[in-house]
């Protein structure tokens, strides 16, 4: 799903207030709901009819440092016999997410939000077929 | 996928530097890759064998203000005949994401990161548990 553009409103102070100095804002330390946990169904990436693999990217100057990307294993979907059926398609499910980028020069550290596109998994779909008639 | 805990390292300055004043950091205005876009296949939520609906939650003090959650429509999966087959299971695919929470008292505005669990879509899996017949 798509994150809408910030425009220039969310991070601004109300109009009646003095502007933010130096183009930066105050970010409080700590993360709300940091202990919340994902309870995804067990091994769904290998049990899915549109299975996927995971690749981990690592960047020490990004939070979270680890970003996991899924890649669909098949073009088609796995049928009841465990064979690939190309009359169906495995397609990625994507999500825009925010990460925090750390920038430092000596002891001067600042942070900036960054939009990252994550492929979270795959799903099996009936293809949309555009039949071309040749005359 | 799960976002690991921050610990207390990512947002801290190097040990040789003076600590961050008042438990807050400098967040630069603007978002890196703001114009990046999701290019998901069309209408996959209705074409999937594990279709889903979307619900939008809206919060003006959160960025992004709009967070979209998916709900699987079926217990089973949709077969080639368009019927629900409960020998297979529709399961949610979830992703932890970061949002920014805005807190203000008058002209004093600060921001804090918040972890949100988003259900992005659904996939069809072969069930692990098969009914045990008692004789």
């Amino acid at each position: 799903r798509k994150i809408p553009k910030v425009g220039h409103t969310f991070f601004q102070k109300p109009e009646s207030c003095p502007p933010v100095p130096g183009g930066s804002m105050k970010l409080d330390i700590g993360i709300i709901n940091e202990n919340q946990r994902v309870s995804m169904s067990r091994n769904i990436e290998s049990r899915s009819t549109s299975p996927w693999n995971y690749t981990v990217t690592w960047d020490p100057n990004r939070y979270p440092s680890e970003v996991v990307q899924a890649q669909c294993r098949n073009l088609g979907c796995i049928n009841a016999q465990g064979k690939e059926d190309i009359s169906m398609n495995s397609v990625p499910i994507q999500q825009e997410t925010l990460v925090v980028r750390r920038k430092h020069q000596g002891c001067s550290v600042s942070f900036q939000l960054e939009k990252v596109l994550v492929t979270v998994g795959c799903t099996c779909v009936t293809p949309v077929i555009h039949h071309v008639q040749h005359h | 996928r799960k976002i690991p805990k921050v610990g207390h390292t990512f947002f801290q300055k190097p040990e040789s530097c003076p600590p961050v004043p008042g438990g807050s950091m400098k967040l630069d205005i603007g978002i890196i890759n703001e114009n990046q876009r999701v290019s998901m296949s069309r209408n996959i939520e209705s074409r999937s064998t594990s279709p889903w609906n979307y619900t939008v939650t809206w919060d003006p003090n959160r960025y992004p203000s709009e967070v979209v959650q998916a709900q699987c429509r079926n217990l089973g999966c949709i077969n080639a005949q368009g019927k629900e087959d409960i020998s297979m299971n529709s399961v949610p695919i979830q992703q932890e994401t970061l949002v920014v929470r805005r807190k203000h008292q008058g002209c004093s505005v600060s921001f804090q990161l918040e972890k949100v669990l988003v259900t992005v879509g659904c996939t069809c899996v072969t069930p692990v548990i098969h009914h045990v017949q008692h004789h």
């Epitope: 309870s39 995804m40 169904s41 067990r42 | 889903w52 609906n53 619900t55 959650q69 998916a70 709900q71 699987c72 429509r73 079926n74 217990l75 089973g76 629900e84 409960i86 299971n89 529709s90 399961v91 949610p92 979830q94 669990l117 259900t119 899996v125 069930p127 692990v128 548990i129 009914h131």
Partner: nanobody, 123 residues
Framework: EVQLVESGGGLVQAGGSLRLSCAAS????????VGWFRQAPGKEREFIGA????????YYAVSEKDRFTISRDNGKNTLYLQMSSLKAEDTAVYYC????????????????WGQGTQVTVSS
């Protein structure tokens, strides 16, 4: 993390009706398949039925199809079980349960369970 709390149980006359509720805490209630089980004295826990995350798909154990109705309200994070034409055999503790996968829930292997609410049908 999901906590489930059942309510609405009690003593009811045979032929009467009762609506059980199950309140869920946790902000991702709509991502869970939720359902009902019951356990009569001295018997095994018995599956009643389940409903999909969106509420579009409902499955009932064959024996209860006509008298029991399962529904959910994701806005209120609540699951319901409407029971009618109650019989003495319906006397049991009724449990609400949640899992992300119907296959686990259906066979009593759900990740989350409530404490149960007692229903007693007097003849």
């Amino acid at each position: 993390e999901v906590q489930l709390v059942e309510s609405g149980g009690g003593l009811v006359q045979a032929g009467g009706s009762l609506r059980l509720s199950c309140a869920a805490s946790g902000r991702t209630f709509s991502s869970y398949v939720v359902g009902w089980f019951r356990q009569a004295p001295g018997k095994e826990r018995e599956f009643i039925g389940a409903i999909s995350g969106s509420g579009d798909s409902i499955y009932y154990a064959v024996s209860e199809k006509d008298r029991f109705t399962i529904s959910r309200d994701n806005g209120k994070n609540t699951l319901y079980l409407q029971m009618s034409s109650l019989k003495a055999e319906d006397t049991a503790v009724y449990y609400c349960t949640a899992d992300q996968e119907f296959g686990y829930l259906r066979f009593g292997r759900s990740e989350y369970w409530g404490q149960g609410t007692q229903v007693t049908v007097s003849s």
